[in-house]
Interface confidence: low
C-alpha cells in the first residue's frame, strides 16, 4: 500500500497520532500513538 503525508488541510485531524494518506484507497488514516485508539485516536485506553 502506497502511503504519504496528509495534506495540510488535515492538520489537527488526528488527536493523538500521525495522519497518513493511503494513496491507493484515497483515504486519510490516523496512526495512533501508544495508548490511543479510534478513528481520530480520540480514545485513551490502558
Amino acid at each position: 500500500v502506497s502511503i504519504t503525508k496528509c495534506s495540510s488541510d488535515m492538520n489537527g485531524y488526528c488527536l493523538h497520532g500521525q495522519c497518513i494518506y493511503l494513496v491507493d484507497m484515497s483515504q486519510n488514516y490516523c496512526r495512533c500513538e501508544v495508548g490511543y485508539t479510534g478513528v481520530r485516536c480520540e480514545h485513551f485506553f490502558l
Partner: antibody, heavy 124, light 107 residues
Framework: HLQLQESGPGLVKSSETLSLTCSVS??????????WGWIRQPPGKGLEWIGS???????YYNPSLKSRVTISADTSKSQYSLKLSSVTAADTAVYYC????????????????WGNGTTVTVSS | DIQMTQSPSSLSASVGDSVTITCRAS??????LNWYQKKPGKAPKVLIY???SLQSGVPSRFSGSGSGTDFTLTISSLQPEDFATYYC?????????FGQGTRLEIK
C-alpha cells in the same frame, strides 16, 4: 474583523425540519485552521454542541443528534447551514454559530468567535 | 460521550471576593478543557483554553488550572461585570461536551 450572523425562521412546526444559515463576514469558511460549528441553548438550560465541520470535508455531530442533523457549507457565499429534522418542543432553543481554531499541535477547539444567536421555537 | 460536571451549580459572592468553580470530567481529558462566560441575551465568551491559557483580551483576574479529570476556574477580586453563568467544555474527543453551568450571583 470576523463576524458571524445566524438567520432563519423563528418558528418551526413540530415534526418539520429546522433550517438555519450562518453568514460569515470579514473572513472565509475555507480558511485553513478553523472549524465552524453550531451550538444551542434551550430555555433555562446549558449549552449543547450540535456539530462542526472543516471546509475540506471533516464533519462531526453530537451523537445524540446525529441521525437528525446535517451541516453543509456554501464557500462561494461564505455561509454554512444547519438542518435539524423531525423537530420537537425539546429543540426549542437559541441557536449559535461559532468558529473554533485548531492546528497540528493542539486540538483545544475553543469557540473564539460567536454569532449573536437566533431563537427558534418549535410549535405543535 | 465524556460527561462534564460543574460545582457548585450556583453561588453568591460580593464584588472584590475571590471565587473558584470546579469542573470534573468523567474520564481523563489531559488539558483539553476550556472555560466560557455567558450573560443573558449574549453569546458565550471564551475566557480560558487548554485548561490554563488566558484568551487574548480577557482580564488577568481570570485563571484556570487542572489536568486529567479535575479543573478549576478562579476569579480573583470579582468585578460587577463578572456576574454571569460559567461553562466548562471539553474537546478531548470528537464529540464536544459542556458542563451544566455555574451561575454566579451578587450577594
Amino acid at each position: 474583523h470576523l463576524q458571524l450572523q445566524e438567520s432563519g425562521p423563528g418558528l418551526v412546526k413540530s415534526s418539520e425540519t429546522l433550517s438555519l444559515t450562518c453568514s460569515v463576514s470579514g473572513g472565509s469558511i475555507s480558511s485553513s485552521g478553523y472549524y465552524w460549528g453550531w451550538i444551542r441553548q434551550p430555555p433555562g438550560k446549558g449549552l449543547e454542541w450540535i456539530g462542526s465541520f472543516y471546509y475540506s470535508g471533516n464533519t462531526y455531530y453530537n451523537p445524540s443528534l446525529k441521525s437528525r442533523v446535517t451541516i453543509s457549507a456554501d464557500t462561494s457565499k461564505s455561509q454554512y447551514s444547519l438542518k435539524l429534522s423531525s423537530v420537537t418542543a425539546a429543540d426549542t432553543a437559541v441557536y449559535y454559530c461559532a468558529r473554533h481554531p485548531f492546528n497540528w499541535n493542539d486540538h483545544y477547539h475553543y469557540m473564539d468567535v460567536w454569532g449573536n444567536g437566533t431563537t427558534v421555537t418549535v410549535s405543535s | 460521550d465524556i460527561q462534564m460536571t460543574q460545582s457548585p451549580s450556583s453561588l453568591s459572592a460580593s464584588v472584590g471576593d475571590s471565587v473558584t468553580i470546579t469542573c470534573r470530567a468523567s474520564q481523563s481529558i489531559s488539558n483539553y478543557l476550556n472555560w466560557y462566560q455567558k450573560k443573558p441575551g449574549k453569546a458565550p465568551k471564551v475566557l480560558i483554553y487548554a485548561a490554563s491559557s488566558l484568551q487574548s483580551g480577557v482580564p488577568s483576574r481570570f485563571s484556570g488550572s487542572g489536568s486529567g479529570t479535575d479543573f478549576t476556574l478562579t476569579i480573583s477580586s470579582l468585578q460587577p461585570e463578572d456576574f454571569a453563568t460559567y461553562y466548562c467544555q471539553q474537546s478531548y474527543i470528537t464529540s464536544i461536551t459542556f458542563g451544566q453551568g455555574t451561575r454566579l450571583e451578587i450577594k
